[in-house]
Protein backbone atom coordinates (compact mmCIF):
# COMPACT_ATOMS: atom_id res chain seq x y z
CA UNK A 1 0.00 0.00 0.00
CA UNK A 2 2.58 2.91 -1.27
CA UNK A 3 1.57 6.67 0.01
CA UNK A 4 0.30 8.75 -2.48
CA UNK A 5 1.06 12.07 -3.20
CA UNK A 6 -1.96 14.90 -2.82
CA UNK A 7 -4.01 15.57 -5.56
CA UNK A 8 -5.42 18.81 -7.11
CA UNK A 9 -9.18 19.27 -8.21
CA UNK A 10 -8.10 20.59 -10.76
CA UNK A 11 -5.77 20.22 -13.65
CA UNK A 12 -5.04 24.35 -12.94
CA UNK A 13 -6.25 27.10 -11.28
CA UNK A 14 -7.28 30.99 -13.05
CA UNK A 15 -9.41 33.93 -11.23
CA UNK A 16 -10.56 36.95 -13.23
CA UNK A 17 -9.85 39.62 -10.95
CA UNK A 18 -10.00 43.62 -11.94
CA UNK A 19 -6.34 45.37 -11.59
CA UNK A 20 -7.65 47.67 -8.60
CA UNK A 21 -8.82 45.01 -6.14
CA UNK A 22 -8.32 45.98 -2.67
CA UNK A 23 -4.80 44.88 -0.84
CA UNK A 24 -6.29 41.69 1.06
CA UNK A 25 -8.90 41.00 -1.42
CA UNK A 26 -9.72 37.30 -1.56
CA UNK A 27 -8.55 36.34 -5.70
CA UNK A 28 -8.69 32.51 -5.48
CA UNK A 29 -8.30 29.58 -4.00
CA UNK A 30 -6.98 26.21 -4.53
CA UNK A 31 -7.69 22.66 -3.40
CA UNK A 32 -6.39 19.06 -3.44
CA UNK A 33 -7.45 15.75 -1.63
CA UNK A 34 -4.91 13.49 0.35
CA UNK A 35 -5.65 9.84 -0.68
CA UNK A 36 -4.86 8.91 2.98
CA UNK A 37 -7.43 11.67 4.04
CA UNK A 38 -3.97 13.16 5.83
CA UNK A 39 -4.07 17.17 6.20
CA UNK A 40 -2.86 19.40 3.20
CA UNK A 41 -0.34 22.30 3.71
CA UNK A 42 -0.38 25.02 0.85
CA UNK A 43 1.86 27.15 -0.34
CA UNK A 44 3.02 29.14 -3.07
CA UNK A 45 6.24 29.10 -5.09
CA UNK A 46 7.37 31.55 -8.02
CA UNK A 47 5.73 34.71 -6.63
CA UNK A 48 8.13 36.95 -8.27
CA UNK A 49 6.32 40.14 -7.93
CA UNK A 50 5.55 39.51 -4.64
CA UNK A 51 1.43 40.19 -4.98
CA UNK A 52 -0.25 36.91 -3.60
CA UNK A 53 -0.30 35.12 -0.49
CA UNK A 54 -2.05 31.28 0.39
CA UNK A 55 -3.94 30.37 3.39
CA UNK A 56 -1.94 27.12 4.16
CA UNK A 57 -5.15 25.63 5.52
CA UNK A 58 -7.88 26.40 3.53
CA UNK A 59 -5.91 27.27 0.07
CA UNK A 60 -7.18 30.54 -0.14
CA UNK A 61 -5.05 33.27 -2.04
CA UNK A 62 -5.64 36.73 -1.32
CA UNK A 63 -3.60 40.23 -2.91
CA UNK A 64 -0.65 41.39 -0.76
CA UNK A 65 0.13 44.70 -2.85
CA UNK A 66 -1.10 46.50 -5.79
CA UNK A 67 -1.67 44.29 -9.02
CA UNK A 68 -0.83 45.65 -12.36
CA UNK A 69 -2.10 44.84 -15.97
CA UNK A 70 0.72 46.35 -17.32
CA UNK A 71 3.50 44.25 -15.35
CA UNK A 72 1.88 41.13 -17.44
CA UNK A 73 -1.59 39.32 -17.29
CA UNK A 74 -2.11 36.43 -16.64
CA UNK A 75 0.16 36.66 -13.38
CA UNK A 76 1.43 32.70 -13.04
CA UNK A 77 2.50 31.23 -10.05
CA UNK A 78 2.99 27.49 -8.78
CA UNK A 79 0.76 26.42 -5.78
CA UNK A 80 2.40 23.42 -3.75
CA UNK A 81 0.13 20.57 -1.12
CA UNK A 82 1.81 19.01 0.81
CA UNK A 83 0.69 16.39 3.32
CA UNK A 84 1.28 16.82 6.99
CA UNK A 85 2.71 14.35 8.90
CA UNK A 86 3.24 10.83 7.19
CA UNK A 87 5.73 11.14 4.12
CA UNK A 88 5.58 14.96 3.84
CA UNK A 89 4.83 14.27 0.16
CA UNK A 90 3.83 17.46 -1.78
CA UNK A 91 2.14 17.96 -5.32
CA UNK A 92 2.63 20.96 -7.59
CA UNK A 93 -0.12 22.54 -9.91
CA UNK A 94 -0.93 26.54 -11.13
CA UNK A 95 -2.58 29.36 -10.27
CA UNK A 96 -2.93 31.90 -13.04
CA UNK A 97 -4.34 35.31 -12.32
CA UNK A 98 -6.17 37.14 -15.07
CA UNK A 99 -5.81 40.54 -14.12
CA UNK A 100 -8.32 42.92 -16.30
CA UNK A 101 -7.34 46.31 -17.66
CA UNK A 102 -8.46 48.96 -15.55
CA UNK A 103 -8.68 52.42 -17.63
CA UNK A 104 -6.30 54.16 -15.03
CA UNK A 105 -4.33 56.44 -17.53
CA UNK A 106 -5.71 59.40 -19.03
CA UNK A 107 -4.90 60.13 -22.98
CA UNK A 108 -2.09 62.54 -23.41
CA UNK A 109 -0.13 64.10 -26.61
CA UNK A 110 2.05 61.45 -28.31
CA UNK A 111 4.81 63.33 -28.72
CA UNK A 112 6.36 67.02 -27.64
CA UNK A 113 4.36 69.39 -30.11
CA UNK A 114 6.45 72.71 -29.12
CA UNK A 115 7.44 74.74 -32.20
CA UNK A 116 4.06 74.42 -34.15
CA UNK A 117 3.90 77.29 -36.13
CA UNK A 118 2.08 79.45 -39.15
CA UNK A 119 3.65 81.90 -40.91
CA UNK A 120 2.00 85.48 -40.04
CA UNK A 121 -0.39 86.53 -41.62
CA UNK A 122 -2.11 83.42 -42.76
CA UNK A 123 -2.65 83.56 -46.70
CA UNK A 124 -5.53 80.92 -45.93
CA UNK A 125 -6.76 78.77 -43.17
CA UNK A 126 -4.21 76.37 -42.00
CA UNK A 127 -4.07 72.96 -40.48
CA UNK A 128 -1.92 70.60 -38.57
CA UNK A 129 -2.35 67.35 -37.28
CA UNK A 130 -1.03 65.41 -33.68
CA UNK A 131 -1.71 62.01 -32.13
CA UNK A 132 -2.38 61.03 -28.67
CA UNK A 133 -1.63 57.75 -26.60
CA UNK A 134 -2.06 56.96 -23.44
CA UNK A 135 -0.48 53.92 -20.45
CA UNK A 136 -3.40 51.61 -21.00
CA UNK A 137 -3.69 47.65 -22.60
CA UNK A 138 -5.92 48.06 -25.55
CA UNK A 139 -5.79 44.42 -25.89
CA UNK A 140 -4.83 45.02 -30.22
CA UNK A 141 -8.45 47.08 -30.72
CA UNK A 142 -6.21 50.11 -30.43
CA UNK A 143 -7.68 53.36 -28.04
CA UNK A 144 -9.98 55.28 -29.56
CA UNK A 145 -9.66 59.15 -28.61
CA UNK A 146 -12.31 61.45 -29.43
CA UNK A 147 -11.29 64.70 -29.55
CA UNK A 148 -12.87 68.08 -28.32
CA UNK A 149 -11.82 72.17 -28.17
CA UNK A 150 -10.77 72.58 -24.11
CA UNK A 151 -13.00 75.35 -23.51
CA UNK A 152 -15.54 77.22 -25.22
CA UNK A 153 -13.86 80.48 -26.04
CA UNK A 154 -11.91 78.69 -28.57
CA UNK A 155 -14.27 77.82 -30.72
CA UNK A 156 -14.12 81.38 -32.66
CA UNK A 157 -10.65 80.40 -33.80
CA UNK A 158 -10.31 76.72 -34.08
CA UNK A 159 -12.01 73.25 -34.91
CA UNK A 160 -10.96 70.08 -34.13
CA UNK A 161 -11.47 66.65 -36.00
CA UNK A 162 -11.07 63.50 -35.31
CA UNK A 163 -8.96 61.44 -38.55
CA UNK A 164 -8.91 57.84 -36.54
CA UNK A 165 -8.58 56.68 -33.20
CA UNK A 166 -5.21 58.51 -32.38
CA UNK A 167 -5.00 61.24 -34.67
CA UNK A 168 -6.60 64.55 -34.78
CA UNK A 169 -6.76 67.87 -37.01
CA UNK A 170 -6.22 71.28 -35.58
CA UNK A 171 -7.57 73.52 -37.73
CA UNK A 172 -7.42 77.75 -37.77
CA UNK A 173 -11.69 79.07 -38.44
CA UNK A 174 -10.04 82.58 -40.17
CA UNK A 175 -7.05 83.87 -41.13
CA UNK A 176 -7.02 86.94 -38.46
CA UNK A 177 -4.80 85.90 -36.11
CA UNK A 178 -2.47 88.03 -34.36
CA UNK A 179 1.69 87.64 -34.39
CA UNK A 180 1.95 85.71 -30.96
CA UNK A 181 1.43 82.36 -29.18
CA UNK A 182 -1.62 80.62 -29.16
CA UNK A 183 -1.96 77.80 -26.44
CA UNK A 184 -4.90 75.47 -27.25
CA UNK A 185 -6.08 73.12 -25.29
CA UNK A 186 -7.57 70.09 -26.47
CA UNK A 187 -9.91 67.73 -24.66
CA UNK A 188 -8.95 64.11 -25.06
CA UNK A 189 -11.08 61.26 -23.81
CA UNK A 190 -10.09 57.59 -24.03
CA UNK A 191 -13.87 56.42 -24.22
CA UNK A 192 -12.91 53.54 -21.10
CA UNK A 193 -14.91 52.06 -18.41
CA UNK A 194 -14.48 54.77 -16.16
CA UNK A 195 -13.71 57.22 -19.07
CA UNK A 196 -10.99 59.22 -18.55
CA UNK A 197 -10.15 62.39 -19.91
CA UNK A 198 -6.69 64.50 -20.32
CA UNK A 199 -6.68 68.23 -21.44
CA UNK A 200 -3.49 68.70 -23.16
CA UNK A 201 -2.03 72.12 -24.62
CA UNK A 202 -0.71 72.62 -28.76
CA UNK A 203 0.99 75.99 -28.31
CA UNK A 204 1.04 77.08 -31.80
CA UNK A 205 2.92 80.76 -32.77
CA UNK A 206 1.92 82.73 -35.86
CA UNK A 207 5.43 84.34 -36.84
CA UNK A 208 6.93 86.04 -39.43
CA UNK A 209 8.85 83.51 -41.80
CA UNK A 210 11.92 83.85 -43.77
CA UNK A 211 12.56 80.46 -46.19
CA UNK A 212 9.49 78.91 -44.53
CA UNK A 213 10.66 79.04 -40.64
CA UNK A 214 9.48 81.54 -37.73
CA UNK A 215 12.20 84.54 -38.05
CA UNK A 216 13.79 84.87 -34.71
CA UNK A 217 16.36 87.46 -33.42
CA UNK A 218 19.69 86.13 -33.06
CA UNK A 219 19.70 83.06 -30.27
CA UNK A 220 16.56 81.96 -31.08
CA UNK A 221 15.78 78.27 -32.65
CA UNK A 222 14.13 78.51 -36.02
CA UNK A 223 10.84 76.51 -35.10
CA UNK A 224 10.01 73.55 -37.41
CA UNK A 225 6.79 74.05 -39.22
CA UNK A 226 3.81 71.65 -39.26
CA UNK A 227 1.65 73.47 -41.51
CA UNK B 1 11.20 34.62 -29.59
CA UNK B 2 9.70 30.93 -27.96
CA UNK B 3 10.10 28.12 -30.71
CA UNK B 4 9.59 24.54 -30.41
CA UNK B 5 10.71 23.14 -32.99
CA UNK B 6 9.92 18.43 -33.33
CA UNK B 7 11.79 15.99 -35.05
CA UNK B 8 11.33 15.01 -38.39
CA UNK B 9 8.12 12.42 -39.91
CA UNK B 10 8.42 8.97 -38.80
CA UNK B 11 7.52 6.25 -41.02
CA UNK B 12 7.27 2.37 -38.32
CA UNK B 13 5.17 -0.80 -38.66
CA UNK B 14 3.17 -2.31 -36.35
CA UNK B 15 4.36 -3.02 -33.24
CA UNK B 16 7.41 -0.77 -33.54
CA UNK B 17 7.83 2.35 -31.08
CA UNK B 18 7.97 5.76 -31.78
CA UNK B 19 10.13 8.47 -30.14
CA UNK B 20 9.46 12.28 -30.84
CA UNK B 21 11.70 15.09 -29.54
CA UNK B 22 10.55 18.20 -29.04
CA UNK B 23 13.08 21.34 -28.52
CA UNK B 24 12.09 24.17 -26.99
CA UNK B 25 14.33 27.66 -26.85
CA UNK B 26 13.30 31.85 -26.24
CA UNK B 27 12.23 31.34 -22.59
CA UNK B 28 12.65 29.39 -19.98
CA UNK B 29 12.23 25.85 -20.34
CA UNK B 30 11.55 24.32 -16.71
CA UNK B 31 8.71 26.69 -16.19
CA UNK B 32 6.01 25.71 -18.37
CA UNK B 33 4.41 22.59 -18.51
CA UNK B 34 5.03 20.68 -21.78
CA UNK B 35 1.79 18.40 -23.63
CA UNK B 36 1.51 16.27 -26.18
CA UNK B 37 -1.42 16.08 -28.60
CA UNK B 38 -2.45 14.27 -31.77
CA UNK B 39 -4.46 14.65 -34.80
CA UNK B 40 -5.66 10.96 -36.81
CA UNK B 41 -6.20 11.89 -40.39
CA UNK B 42 -10.10 13.57 -40.66
CA UNK B 43 -9.97 13.49 -37.01
CA UNK B 44 -9.51 16.42 -34.51
CA UNK B 45 -7.32 16.69 -31.46
CA UNK B 46 -6.78 14.47 -29.20
CA UNK B 47 -4.86 15.03 -25.46
CA UNK B 48 -2.28 12.68 -24.53
CA UNK B 49 -0.50 14.02 -21.53
CA UNK B 50 2.32 16.28 -20.10
CA UNK B 51 5.12 16.09 -18.42
CA UNK B 52 6.42 18.86 -16.18
CA UNK B 53 10.23 19.71 -16.79
CA UNK B 54 10.71 21.27 -14.01
CA UNK B 55 9.83 18.21 -11.90
CA UNK B 56 9.86 15.34 -14.61
CA UNK B 57 6.29 14.44 -13.35
CA UNK B 58 3.95 13.40 -15.87
CA UNK B 59 0.50 12.74 -16.41
CA UNK B 60 -0.97 10.64 -19.48
CA UNK B 61 -4.48 9.93 -20.91
CA UNK B 62 -5.77 7.02 -19.86
CA UNK B 63 -6.07 5.81 -23.40
CA UNK B 64 -2.51 5.79 -23.65
CA UNK B 65 -1.45 5.31 -20.32
CA UNK B 66 0.43 1.87 -20.81
CA UNK B 67 1.88 2.74 -24.11
CA UNK B 68 3.22 6.09 -23.54
CA UNK B 69 6.84 8.02 -21.95
CA UNK B 70 7.35 11.22 -21.90
CA UNK B 71 10.55 12.47 -20.84
CA UNK B 72 13.02 15.78 -21.08
CA UNK B 73 16.46 16.72 -20.76
CA UNK B 74 17.04 19.73 -19.60
CA UNK B 75 20.12 20.36 -20.81
CA UNK B 76 19.06 20.60 -24.25
CA UNK B 77 15.47 22.22 -23.21
CA UNK B 78 14.21 19.22 -24.87
CA UNK B 79 11.20 16.67 -24.55
CA UNK B 80 10.21 13.36 -25.92
CA UNK B 81 7.21 11.46 -26.31
CA UNK B 82 7.61 7.80 -27.13
CA UNK B 83 4.54 5.86 -27.98
CA UNK B 84 5.00 1.85 -28.30
CA UNK B 85 2.97 -0.82 -29.53
CA UNK B 86 2.09 0.99 -32.90
CA UNK B 87 -1.07 0.19 -34.69
CA UNK B 88 -2.31 1.93 -37.88
CA UNK B 89 -4.71 3.74 -35.93
CA UNK B 90 -1.70 5.76 -34.06
CA UNK B 91 -1.05 7.28 -37.91
CA UNK B 92 -1.46 10.97 -36.72
CA UNK B 93 0.28 14.44 -36.69
CA UNK B 94 1.56 14.81 -33.38
CA UNK B 95 1.85 18.37 -31.99
CA UNK B 96 4.28 19.12 -28.35
CA UNK B 97 2.77 22.23 -27.30
CA UNK B 98 3.16 25.01 -24.14
CA UNK B 99 0.83 25.07 -21.33
CA UNK B 100 -0.40 28.30 -20.19
CA UNK B 101 -4.06 28.53 -20.16
CA UNK B 102 -4.71 26.53 -23.13
CA UNK B 103 -1.46 26.24 -25.02
CA UNK B 104 0.03 29.14 -26.10
CA UNK B 105 2.56 27.75 -28.64
CA UNK B 106 2.68 24.39 -30.73
CA UNK B 107 5.32 22.70 -32.33
CA UNK B 108 5.23 23.02 -36.27
CA UNK B 109 4.25 19.00 -35.98
CA UNK B 110 5.48 15.42 -36.72
CA UNK B 111 3.82 13.07 -39.15
CA UNK B 112 4.08 9.72 -37.83
CA UNK B 113 2.78 6.85 -40.13
CA UNK B 114 2.06 3.08 -38.80
CA UNK B 115 2.02 1.02 -41.98
CA UNK B 116 3.41 -2.50 -42.69
CA UNK C 1 -14.12 12.38 -19.33
CA UNK C 2 -15.65 16.19 -20.01
CA UNK C 3 -17.06 16.03 -23.47
CA UNK C 4 -16.73 18.99 -25.72
CA UNK C 5 -19.95 19.45 -28.44
CA UNK C 6 -19.34 21.81 -30.81
CA UNK C 7 -21.97 23.41 -33.63
CA UNK C 8 -22.06 23.67 -36.33
CA UNK C 9 -19.18 21.08 -38.09
CA UNK C 10 -18.87 23.37 -41.08
CA UNK C 11 -19.93 26.80 -42.02
CA UNK C 12 -20.07 28.69 -44.74
CA UNK C 13 -19.75 32.11 -44.60
CA UNK C 14 -18.57 35.74 -46.45
CA UNK C 15 -16.10 38.04 -45.83
CA UNK C 16 -17.59 40.96 -43.71
CA UNK C 17 -19.69 38.60 -41.83
CA UNK C 18 -20.84 37.73 -38.32
CA UNK C 19 -20.43 34.60 -37.37
CA UNK C 20 -20.96 32.20 -34.37
CA UNK C 21 -19.56 29.07 -33.06
CA UNK C 22 -20.70 27.08 -30.02
CA UNK C 23 -19.24 24.95 -27.54
CA UNK C 24 -20.93 22.90 -24.97
CA UNK C 25 -19.17 20.70 -22.11
CA UNK C 26 -21.01 17.65 -20.67
CA UNK C 27 -20.22 19.45 -17.53
CA UNK C 28 -19.48 22.45 -15.43
CA UNK C 29 -16.06 23.79 -16.91
CA UNK C 30 -15.92 27.34 -15.30
CA UNK C 31 -14.81 29.19 -18.21
CA UNK C 32 -12.01 26.92 -18.07
CA UNK C 33 -12.00 27.23 -22.05
CA UNK C 34 -9.27 27.82 -25.04
CA UNK C 35 -10.51 28.52 -28.68
CA UNK C 36 -8.10 27.96 -31.27
CA UNK C 37 -7.63 28.83 -35.21
CA UNK C 38 -6.17 25.86 -37.17
CA UNK C 39 -5.47 26.12 -40.76
CA UNK C 40 -4.03 23.14 -43.20
CA UNK C 41 -0.74 22.27 -42.75
CA UNK C 42 -0.12 24.78 -39.62
CA UNK C 43 0.10 24.96 -35.89
CA UNK C 44 -3.34 25.51 -33.86
CA UNK C 45 -2.86 28.73 -32.61
CA UNK C 46 -4.44 30.17 -29.32
CA UNK C 47 -7.44 32.52 -29.89
CA UNK C 48 -8.89 32.66 -26.33
CA UNK C 49 -8.35 31.44 -23.08
CA UNK C 50 -9.98 31.87 -19.54
CA UNK C 51 -13.64 31.56 -21.97
CA UNK C 52 -13.36 35.65 -22.88
CA UNK C 53 -10.08 36.93 -22.57
CA UNK C 54 -8.17 37.11 -25.81
CA UNK C 55 -4.57 35.49 -26.53
CA UNK C 56 -1.70 38.13 -27.36
CA UNK C 57 -1.40 39.45 -30.92
CA UNK C 58 -5.19 38.28 -31.80
CA UNK C 59 -7.55 41.10 -33.40
CA UNK C 60 -10.53 42.30 -31.93
CA UNK C 61 -12.86 41.03 -34.04
CA UNK C 62 -12.77 37.78 -32.08
CA UNK C 63 -13.97 37.62 -28.85
CA UNK C 64 -15.88 35.10 -26.38
CA UNK C 65 -18.86 34.71 -24.33
CA UNK C 66 -20.10 31.81 -21.89
CA UNK C 67 -20.47 30.57 -18.53
CA UNK C 68 -21.48 26.85 -16.71
CA UNK C 69 -21.22 24.55 -19.78
CA UNK C 70 -22.08 26.84 -22.40
CA UNK C 71 -19.87 28.48 -24.82
CA UNK C 72 -19.34 30.77 -27.59
CA UNK C 73 -16.80 32.09 -30.26
CA UNK C 74 -18.00 35.13 -32.08
CA UNK C 75 -16.36 36.51 -35.36
CA UNK C 76 -17.74 39.73 -35.72
CA UNK C 77 -16.56 40.66 -39.61
CA UNK C 78 -14.92 37.51 -40.84
CA UNK C 79 -11.85 38.59 -42.88
CA UNK C 80 -10.19 36.76 -45.97
CA UNK C 81 -7.39 35.02 -43.60
CA UNK C 82 -10.03 33.76 -40.99
CA UNK C 83 -11.10 31.10 -43.00
CA UNK C 84 -9.81 28.17 -41.37
CA UNK C 85 -11.12 25.11 -38.97
CA UNK C 86 -11.84 26.58 -35.20
CA UNK C 87 -11.88 24.22 -31.95
CA UNK C 88 -12.67 24.35 -28.28
CA UNK C 89 -10.81 22.64 -25.19
CA UNK C 90 -11.37 22.79 -21.76
CA UNK C 91 -8.33 22.73 -19.45
CA UNK C 92 -10.62 22.41 -16.28
CA UNK C 93 -9.06 18.25 -15.06
CA UNK C 94 -7.37 16.13 -17.21
CA UNK C 95 -7.99 14.34 -19.60
CA UNK C 96 -8.09 17.52 -21.62
CA UNK C 97 -10.64 17.36 -24.43
CA UNK C 98 -11.31 19.22 -27.29
CA UNK C 99 -14.21 20.00 -29.43
CA UNK C 100 -14.46 18.10 -32.84
CA UNK C 101 -13.64 21.14 -34.76
CA UNK C 102 -16.01 23.69 -37.07
CA UNK C 103 -15.02 24.37 -40.63
CA UNK C 104 -15.55 27.75 -41.73
CA UNK C 105 -15.54 28.03 -45.76
CA UNK C 106 -15.80 31.36 -47.94
CA UNK C 107 -19.18 30.98 -49.75
Known amino acids: DVNEAPQFSQHVFQAKVSEDVAIGTKVGNVTAKDPEGLDISYSLRGDTRGWLKIDHVTGEIFSVAPLDREAGSPYRVQVVATEVGGSSLSSVSEFHLILMDVNDNPPRLAKDYTGLFFCHPLSAPGSLIFEATDDDQHLFRGPHFTFSLGSGSLQNDWEVSKINGTHARLSTRHTEFEEREYVVLIRINDGGRPPLEGIVSLPVTFCSCVEGSCFRPAGHKHHHHHH | QVQLVQSGAEVKKPGASVKVSCKASGYSFSSYWMHWMRQAPGQGQEWMGY????????EYNQKFKDRVTMTRDTSTSTVYMELSSLRSEDTAVYYC?????????WGQGTLVTVSS | DIQMTQSPSSLSASVGDRVTITCRAS??????LAWYQHKEGKSPKLLLY???VLADGVPSRFSGSGSGTDYTLTISSLQPEDFARYYC?????????FGQGTKLEIK
Open chain 3, 27 to 32: ENIDSY
Open chain 3, 50 to 52: AAT
Open chain 2, 51 to 58: INPSTDYT
Open chain 3, 89 to 97: QHYYRTPLT
Open chain 2, 97 to 105: ARSRLGFDY
